[in-house]
Amino acid sequence: GSERACCPVNWVEHERSCYWFSRSGKAWADADNYCRLEDAHLVVVTSWEEQKFVQHHIGPVNTWMGLHDQNGPWKWVDGTDYETGFKNWRPEQPDDWYGHGLGGGEDCAHFTDDGRWNDDVCQRPYRWVCETELDKASQEPPLL
């Protein structure tokens, strides 16, 4: 999304990002689209500190994040590198179980009830979190 100077109403500011926590449930693609329409993206988790922040706000409910492997390798929706980045999968996950017969495995990642990640069928009606970055220019100290 475009950079902002302050968070929109009903969004939560944390570490120079703004977060919006859904209450209803949507399929991953619908949640992804919702965030894009808000000039944001599904949450990208880049640190343990950010993981704890998000986990605190979503509670013990399955919640989509901006991570998927619908085109092959796992990718974050904002382009953050998956291989070198933060990960918090449940043991044995992601298993990309192909038995569900949807043609491409379990292609979307979500926070589980204990906060760790799982891959699941993207059509499941889970909650989601949108994220947008604050104006990076505002982080610079003013010129004297």
């Epitope: 209803s24 449930g25 409910v61 038995g99 569900h100 949807l102 069928v121 059509q123 499941r124 009606p125």
Partner: antibody
Amino acid sequence: QVQLVESGGGVVQPGRSLRLSCAASGFTFSTYGMHWVRQAPGKGLEWVAVIWYDGSNKNYADSVKGRFTISRDNSKNTLYLQMNSLRAEDTAVYYCARDQGVGYDGLDVWGQGTTVTVSS
Amino acid sequence: DIQMTQSPSSLSASVGDRVTITCRTSQGIGNYLAWFQQKPGKAPKSLLYKASSLQSGVPSKFSGSGSGTDFTLTISSLQPEDFATYYCQQYMTYPLTFGGGTKVEIK
């Protein structure tokens, strides 16, 4: 033991309203999603609506959307179904059922049902 | 909406028979499928969830299998109390949808 008891059914004229209740006991009501499912005489089961554990998410079958409203009062351990603009095709036994989780995990426990008859 | 097709719609069997009921969905649903048993004048009873997981208290003569679009409920040895109507249901997404039911009758 886990129990769901529906009430509020009866005979009502087309176009009128009715409110069904489902009293829950034997489990922590506020941590489970709840559903309404109906069964017309001699027919199969039809899902009607779901409400998540905290009331935050509600979904309806197309056949009742805009006419029925699902709600819950966690302080009273009670689920409701407000039925407006009733039609003859709404005649059915209405069951409340507990979700296995917060609202997207399938049904496990069912009530005994309450009968709604829409007739002039 | 996801359509559920159950077959057969009815079957006649004898006590001790092995009975198989199938459920096919119009699109893949993973393993988000449940099976229910209903006797005349009674509420449905949950038998299995996640296609193959037995609900607490349900005897092991009931088993389920399948994933994607094709699912099976098997009763290994039919007993008098098993004569009832059986329904499959998908809960991958809303609206939840049921199969039309399979009535298991005494031969």
